[in-house]
């Protein structure tokens, strides 16, 4: 068997040692003779010790035994005992007890011969096995004194060998990790949850993670079980970006010919149905009536102008009803209505002329007369000297319902080259000049406008009165909407409940699905926040779509230019929509084109104004606009501006 | 352009009489009346009346009752003013304005200056 | 007849001075008033009319108000060009009259 050589020389010193017995004894007797029973020089004990350093050592040490017990002439037995323990390096043992093996005296030296795992002059030194190759460790290697032991970090068990380790599989344990799934790791396990989900050590248990209290989204935040949304104030005209949490502008996709004319007065700016323009003439002279303009419109019915005095006095009234002009006329509180003429809402330009002569009005389209009245009377009126008239454009001054025959008075209508009383107007152009909102668009189509800043309401009724049912249905809702969008996101048609500030329903255009988290162009139909279905949709093409909505007891589907749309709910979910719908529908609620009221972003998926042209049929009647109980100002209600033409 | 052009300046002795002119342009002369208002030196203005462009039919302040005259040319759109047996009093700057209830147009002015 | 009392006759202020002009009438001429600058040697020029209408090419530094009896003429921030004399005139029965004047000069 070999031996390290550290302990192959601790074996072999003590052997030594005893080769040298019989020379120390007799050293010994020596050291008697001469330095114990005589006083010796440093000569003689040289000759003692044969050797100088154990006479260095030896002889400062005898002069301090003489010192202590005088010489050895005085007998005195402490000084005998003293020199006699003066060569013995190991008496008393400078070694340390617990480590050394054996002490061995050298000449004025010793040597400790330490016990294994001991080590140092003294063998008080602890050796530390884990400095070399870990002590043979696999993991742990742990110094002890005298010795040392091998461990393993935790998950792991010590083998057999008591050096290396193996891998605890605590999966075997059904408890482990209670509900969540549990999976076993070198030394460790994890207990795993779905997405949005994170595990509860306490509770041994998924739980969901409020994403929202991460600061996730840049607006508004709603958590839901496993994941979240984030909301952007779509009223302020901001969307989802494409990372789903932070806002971006809701720009338009498709460019629409929206210049105005600065030298054209438009005459639906103000849904009042008060004038755009109101004008007060007064002569000296006795003057007579002369109106010339260029006019267009696609709007079937309204007020193009007034002139006269008050109401119950003499006034003129040119409307249009059913695209024919319309005269109303009242002279010294006697009323008359005359209609005629070709229909004229083409939305074509055409010259219109009302003229004032000595005993008749003449009313002309494109220079032919289409009226010829007979008046007992003047349209300017004499007072205090002067003659007055009031000339008002797109409305008159006092209410719809004290014309002769109550008309709309709001005209979505455009004027051009006017010409009141022979005179040039600087006034009207100077302001029109300065007022975009006074200016017409240049170029217009069919349909209705929505600028993406406003909506408009009307106070309809879903439910069926008990004359209408045939079927088992009590209501329904039904609802065309041809669109030519230029913006990707923006409420087409809602239903908003003002009692409870909720949104029952709405269809609306969106650029990303919500629960895929996955930008993508749709329509999307939904009662309150719940999405029922979703349908792709070109938005962007400049095209005409047409997006067809029904609902009714039982049944929701949606339809984009005939294709049907992706049912987003089971139809367990579906009958509790649609019977929340029903409750709100049996309450009053408010029919919205174009937009939202200022509801909360979460109250539907979308809130944004839709942008580009619209017409919509509710329970197979067209919506009119100039019928609505509000329209914003900058909707136009007939007419809507091209898509501008791609350049080339 | 709507234009009123008045005669120059005149300088007129007490007694005599001054026909000064306002000549129309831009417009249908007849569709407004034409009023003529005066102005004495560093005093405000003071309106004299007006004449109805269509049947020549004049209108004076009671001050104006008298001596003056409103006439009209339609046929060169010009309308006057006539002044007989004038006084030192009547030194003033003559202005025609069209009528539009009030004025807006007027003529440059003419001064008229009665001295001995 | 209606009168019209119009103060101050005249008027000594700064460049930038907000200035004001009153006109107070005999009887109530309703929004009836018209407000006129001359300068000399030219005609008077109309820079409000009936309704407190500031007419075209009037800069916005002028405004007109009151009805009734009460008007007032404002000249928000006075310019070295609106040194001149100021004149109200009624338009609501005949005779037409006008104001006395105030004349607004350099201080």
């Known amino acids: 068997a070999l031996l390290p050589a550290r302990e192959a020389t601790q074996f072999l010193r003590p052997r030594q040692r005893r080769a040298f017995q019989v020379f120390e004894e007799a050293k010994q007797g020596h050291l008697e003779r001469e330095c114990v029973e005589e006083l010796c020089s440093r000569e003689e004990a040289r000759e003692v010790f044969e050797n100088d350093p154990e006479t260095d050592y030896f002889y400062p040490r005898y002069l301090d035994c003489i010192n202590k017990y005088g010489s050895p002439y005085t007998k005195n037995s402490g000084f005998a005992t003293c020199v006699q323990n003066l060569p013995d390096q190991c008496t008393p043992n400078p070694c340390d007890r617990k480590g050394t093996q054996a002490c061995q005296d050298l000449m004025g030296n010793f040597f400790c011969l330490c016990k294994a795992g001991w080590g140092g002059r003294l063998c008080d030194k602890d050796v530390n096995e884990c400095s070399q190759e870990n002590g043979g460790c696999l993991q742990i290697c742990h110094n002890k004194p005298g010795s040392f032991h091998c461990s393993c970090h935790s998950g792991f068990e010590l083998s057999s060998d008591g050096r290396t380790c193996q891998d605890i599989d605590e999966c075997a344990d059904s408890e482990a990790c209670g509900e969540a799934r549990c999976k076993n790791l070198p030394g460790s396990y994890s207990c795993l949850c779905d997405e949005g989900f994170a595990y509860s050590s306490q509770e041994k248990a998924c739980r969901d993670v409020d994403e929202c209290l991460q600061g996730r989204c840049e607006q508004v935040c709603v958590n839901s079980p496993g994941s979240y949304t984030c909301h952007c104030d779509g009223r302020g005209g901001l969307k989802l970006s494409q990372d789903m949490d932070t806002c971006e502008d809701i720009l338009p996709c498709v460019p629409f010919s929206v210049a105005k004319s600065v030298k054209s007065l438009y005459l639906g700016r103000m849904f009042s149905g008060t004038p755009v323009i109101r004008l007060r003439f007064k002569r000296l002279q006795p003057t007579r009536l002369v109106a010339e303009f260029d006019f267009r419109t696609f709007d079937p019915e309204g007020i193009l102008l007034f002139a006269g005095g008050h109401q119950d006095s003499t006034w003129i009234v040119l409307a249009l009803r059913a695209g024919r002009l319309e005269l109303q006329l009242r002279y010294n509180g006697v009323g008359r209505v005359t209609s005629s003429g070709p229909v004229i809402n083409h939305g074509m330009w055409q010259t219109i002329s009302v003229e004032e002569l000595a005993r008749n009005l003449v009313i002309k389209v494109n220079r032919d007369a289409v009226m010829k009245i007979a008046v007992a009377g003047d349209l300017f009126q004499p007072e205090r000297g002067l003659y007055h008239l009031n000339l008002t454009v797109g409305g008159i001054p006092f209410h719809e319902k004290d014309l002769v025959q109550p008309i709309n008075p709001r005209l979505d209508g455009c004027m051009r080259s006017w010409n009141w009383l022979n005179g040039e107007d600087t006034t009207i152009q100077e302001t029109v000049k300065v007022n975009t909102r006074m200016q017409c668009f240049s170029v217009t189509e069919r349909g209705s406008f929505y600028p993406g800043s406003g909506f408009a309401f009307y106070s309809l009724d879903y439910m069926r009165t008990p004359l209408d049912v045939g079927t088992e249905s009590t209501w329904e809702v039904e609802v065309v909407a041809h669109i030519r969008p230029a913006a990707d996101t923006g409420v087409l048609f809602a239903l908003w409940a003002p009692d409870l500030r909720a949104v029952p329903l709405s269809v609306a255009l969106v650029d990303y699905h919500s629960t895929k988290k996955l930008k993508k162009q749709l329509v999307v139909l939904a009662v309150e926040h719940t999405a029922l279905a979703l349908m792709e949709i070109k938005v962007c093409d400049g095209q005409e779509h047409v997006v067809t909505v029904s609902l009714r007891d039982g049944e929701a589907t949606l339809e984009v230019d005939g294709t049907r749309g992706q049912s987003e709910v089971s139809a367990a979910q579906l009958q509790e929509r649609l019977a929340v719908l029903e409750r709100h529908l049996r309450s009053p609620v408010l029919t919205f084109a174009g937009g939202l009221p200022d509801v909360p972003v979460t109250s539907a998926p979308v809130t944004a104004f839709y942008r580009g042209c619209m017409t919509l049929e509710v329970n197979r009647r067209l919506l009119d606009l100039d019928e609505a109980a509000y329209k914003h100002s900058d909707i136009t209600a007939h007419s809507c501006p091209p898509v501008e033409p791609a350049a080339a | 352009q709507v234009h009123l052009v008045q005669s120059g300046s005149e300088l007129k002795k007490p007694g005599a009489s001054v026909k000064i002119s306002c000549k129309a342009s831009g417009y249908t002369f007849t569709n407004y009346g034409m009023n003529w208002v005066r102005q004495a030196p560093g005093q405000g203005l003071e309106w004299m009346g007006w004449?109805?462009?269509?049947?020549?039919?004049?209108t004076y302040t009671e001050e104006f009752k008298g001596r003056f005259v409103f006439s009209l040319d339609t046929s060169v759109t010009t309308s006057y003013l006539q002044i007989s047996t004038l006084k030192a009093e009547d030194t003033a700057v003559y202005f025609c304005a069209r009528d539009e209830g009030w004025f807006v147009y007027w003529g440059q002015g003419t001064l008229v200056t009665v001295s001995s | 007849e209606t009168t019209l009392t119009q103060s101050p006759s005249s008027l000594s202020a700064s460049v930038g001075d907000r200035v004001t002009i009153t006109c107070i009438t005999s009887?109530?001429?309703?929004?009836?008033m018209n407000w006129y600058q001359q300068k000399p040697g030219k005609a008077p020029k109309l820079l409000i009319s009936e309704g407190n209408t500031l007419r075209p090419g009037v800069p916005s530094r002028f405004s007109g108000s009151g009805s009734g009896t009460d008007f007032t003429l404002t000249i928000s921030s006075l310019q070295p060009e609106d040194f001149a004399t100021y004149y109200c005139?009624?338009?609501?029965?005949?005779?037409?009259?006008f104001g006395q004047g105030t004349k607004v000069e350099i201080k």
């Open positions: 009887t109530d001429i309703d929004d009836d």
């Open positions: 004449i109805n462009t269509n049947t020549g039919e004049p």
């Open positions: 005139l009624q338009t609501d029965s005949v005779p037409l009259t």
